[in-house]
């Protein structure tokens, strides 16, 4: 994709003055460079692409091309007065002289170093001028990591060991990830340091401190973020079987979210040693806080549920180390922490959290008062949503999406199943018309239930005080108009009588005379067409 700089095309639809201003500000010459940074490996050559569109009749004698460091304006390379002025940058730059006449102003940078990283400006001047900046991103791949262990002998389960992962001569700084044999990320107790050498290349050393299990694989991944290159190494530690060997019990780190009424699986696993048989296994699930027994497997058999007969193990998977518990028809009261306790030769335990949730119903909206509403009235809008868990977050907003926070009262009541009914009351003064929306959010499910009401007040209604003022003024105005009409009528009548009296004194065709109130006959003249004289 090309990034265009100094394009005059934007002025086309603008007035002449704006066009001239645009021309002055950006120059008329269009210089094109890549939008994305140019990625170059240390020690290789890189081409910083730059091009312009030569006009007909263009000759190199007219061309002035200057490459410089964008920030410092330090000269890198130039072409002026019809000839290549050479490199001003450690003699490691070159143009493409054969291609200049076609508008190719690209710069070749040889034996790239870390210090070259940055922005380079390509400045082209012919009759007009233009410039654009291209970024050079330097990169160097990291070596395959080497792994060291401290201590590295007489290791027993339960020992704390320090695993060091070292990778060399990379650029830019690496991202380091540790994971166990199952691919689970290990983030705690990791210390990573990166040191740049005199060439600016980084050596990365990442240290992981772990407590050994029965045995384990630890992998280190060094990622070059620019090259998206991953360098891997791993170490497998098999400690001596020893008194310090706890059973490593694994459960999910995040709470298990279960909908009310559905079944939930509380995952728990352990690593069976070679020769393990179910006769050796003792598995006990209990409530973490009260230690109340939930389910157990001892003496080689499932001892069943001690928790309202709603729990079950996965018997076919136990021998593979799957100690998960199935909890049926989840209730709000089930929420909390469950401990998975596994005892074989040694023992271990881990707690898993169960987070219960129930979606809220679509809110129903009620209005009080709900008739004869007029702008200026205060109304109470109630938004009700039912049978959700945990407690909801309620948000009000107007038709424009503006939050309404004042005069909101929200109450949440739990029913006998522990599910919440939420009632949120908004008091507002009505405008001419308005939409009011209520959003009920379940914070665990990230589920939003919306309800809205649009209130359209009676169009020509006013508050009572304004009504009486309006009525009074209207009556006065009508009375005034009636009086005015009466006076006019009297005046006209009087002048008619006087005119009639005058006409009787003259000789004439009585019938042919016209009163001032009668219209004249239309003449044939077009100009007079449509005229009315009163």
């Amino acid at each position: 994709m090309l990034r265009r700089r100094g394009s005059p095309g934007m002025g086309v639809h603008v007035g002449a003055a704006l066009g001239a201003l645009w021309f002055c500000l950006t120059g008329a010459l269009e210089v094109q460079v890549p939008e994305d940074p140019v990625v170059a490996l240390v020690g290789t050559d890189a081409t910083l692409c730059c091009s312009f569109s030569p006009e007909p009749g263009f000759s190199l004698a007219q061309l002035n091309l200057i490459w410089q460091l964008t920030d410092t304006k330090q000269l890198v390379h130039s072409f002026a007065e019809g000839q290549d002025q050479g490199s001003a940058y450690a003699n490691r730059t070159a143009l493409f002289p054969d291609l200049l006449a076609q508008g190719n102003a690209s710069l070749r940078l040889q034996r790239v170093r870390v210090a070259d990283e940055g922005s380079f400006t390509c400045f082209v001047s012919i009759r007009d001028f233009g410039s654009a900046a291209v970024s050079l991103q330097v990169a160097a791949p990291y070596s395959k990591p080497s792994m060291t262990l401290e201590p590295n002998k007489d290791l027993r389960p339960g020992d704390t060991v320090t695993i060091t992962c070292s990778s060399y001569q990379g650029y830019p700084e690496a991202e380091v990830f540790w994971q166990d044999g199952q691919g689970v990320p290990l983030t705690g107790n990791v210390t990573t340091s990166q040191m740049a050498n005199e060439q600016g290349l980084f050596d990365v050393h990442s240290i992981l401190r772990v407590v050994l299990g029965a045995n384990g694989t630890y992998s280190c991944l060094v990622r070059n973020p620019v090259l998206q290159q991953d360098a891997h190494s791993s170490v497998t530690i098999t400690p001596q079987r020893s008194p310090t060997g706890a059973v490593e019990v694994q459960v999910p780190e995040d709470p298990v979210v279960a909908l009310v009424g559905t079944d939930a699986t509380l995952r728990c696993s352990f690593s069976p040693e070679p020769g393990f048989s179910l006769a050796q296994l003792n598995l006990i699930w209990q409530l973490t806080d009260t230690k109340q027994l939930v389910h157990s497997f001892t003496e080689g058999r499932d001892q069943g549920s001690a928790y309202a007969n709603r729990t079950a193990l996965f018997p076919d998977l136990l021998a593979q180390g799957n100690a998960s518990l199935r909890l049926q028809r989840v209730r709000v009261a089930d929420e909390g922490s469950f401990t998975c306790f596994v005892s074989i030769r040694d023992f271990g335990s881990a707690a898993v959290s169960l987070q219960v949730a129930a979606p809220y119903s679509k809110p129903s909206m009620t209005l009080e008062p709900n008739k004869d509403l007029r702008p200026g009235d205060t109304v109470t809008i109630t938004c009700s949503s039912y049978r959700g868990y945990p407690e909801a977050e309620v948000f009000w907003q107007d038709g424009q999406g503006v939050p309404l926070t004042g005069n909101v009262t929200t109450s949440q009541m739990a029913n006998e199943q522990g599910l919440f009914d939420v009632h949120s009351v908004l008091r507002v003064v009505l405008g001419a018309n308005g939409t009011y929306s209520c959003l009920v959010r379940n914070p665990v499910l990230q589920q939003d239930a919306h309800g809205s009401v649009t209130i359209t007040g009676q169009p020509m209604t006013f508050p009572p005080e304004a009504l009486w003022v309006t009525v009074g003024l209207s009556v006065c105005l009508i009375a005034l108009l009636v009086a005015l009409a009466f006076v006019c009528w009297r005046k006209i009548k009087q002048s008619c009588e006087e005119e009639n009296a005058g006409a009787e004194d003259q000789d004439g065709e009585g019938e042919g005379s016209k009163t001032a109130l009668q219209p004249l006959k239309h003449s044939d003249s077009k100009e007079d067409d449509g005229q009315e004289i009163a």
Partner: antibody, heavy 119, light 109 residues
Framework: EVQLVQSGAEVKKPGSSVKVSCKAS????????ISWVRQAPGQGLEWMGG????????NYAQKFQGRVTITADESTSTAYMELSSLRSEDTAVYYC????????????WGQGTLVTVSA | EIVLTQSPATLSLSPGERATLSCRAS??????LAWYQQKPGQAPRLLIY???NRATGIPARFSGSGSGTDFTLTISSLEPEDFAVYYC???????????FGQGTKLEIK
């Protein structure tokens, strides 16, 4: 460093009760199996019972069932052993002991508490 | 309840000699058997666990063997500091309950 520090010596009357404490340091108290072992003068070791705090339920040797109560307070990392209906033959050194995390083996011992039952 | 019987009750040997201590269970104890050493005025010390594994810091002259109901602790060449009382101990699978043998006193001849 693992340490189990027990309460001091006690002299008790027959028929009374004694409660010995054992405060643990150096590790996650909840994840260890704590045992109580006693040794009468010139006699062998006798396991009385034990508890895994994270599990919560104590187990007792048949001989002491009904007379001994073992508890653990996770908040203070302290285990307790209470022996009731004391008789003269309960005169002994009472040890609390534990293994490594997740191990049933007993390889760390308290200094012992001498309980003397005498009229 | 499992009973552990140790023999002999007392064993008199000289430094440099080989000591063999026996522990018999009234019923099979799998391999959950341990050996402890106790010196006068001290708490016991774990020597062997799971019948044959040497605990941390225990010299190689101590070894354990056996399975099921018969177990043996062997000290290949006695050192002066090895003279003490030795106890075997078993653990039941579930619930975890322990039994100690009555002990074998190893004394200098």
């Amino acid at each position: 460093e693992v340490q189990l520090v027990q309460s001091g010596a006690e002299v008790k009357k027959p028929g009374s009760s004694v409660k010995v404490s054992c405060k643990a340091s150096g590790g996650t108290f909840s994840s260890y199996a704590i045992s109580w072992v006693r040794q009468a003068p010139g006699q062998g070791l006798e396991w009385m019972g034990g508890i895994i705090p994270i599990f919560g339920t104590a187990n007792y040797a048949q001989k002491f069932q009904g007379r001994v109560t073992i508890t653990a307070d996770e908040s203070t990392s302290t285990a307790y052993m209470e022996l009731s209906s004391l008789r003269s033959e309960d005169t002994a050194v009472y040890y609390c002991a534990r293994g490594e995390r997740g191990s049933y083996l007993i390889d760390y011992w308290g200094q012992g508490t001498l309980v003397t039952v005498s009229a | 309840e499992i009973v552990l019987t140790q023999s002999p009750a007392t064993l008199s040997l000289s430094p440099g000699e080989r000591a063999t201590l026996s522990c018999r269970a009234s019923q099979s104890v799998s391999s959950y058997l341990a050996w402890y050493q106790q010196k006068p005025g001290q708490a016991p010390r774990l020597l062997i666990y799971d019948a044959s594994n040497r605990a941390t810091g225990i010299p190689a002259r101590f070894s354990g063997s056996g399975s099921g109901t018969d177990f043996t602790l062997t000290i290949s060449s006695l050192e002066p500091e090895d003279f003490a009382v030795y106890y075997c101990q078993q653990r039941s699978n579930w619930p975890p309950m322990y039994t100690f043998g009555q002990g074998t006193k190893l004394e200098i001849k």
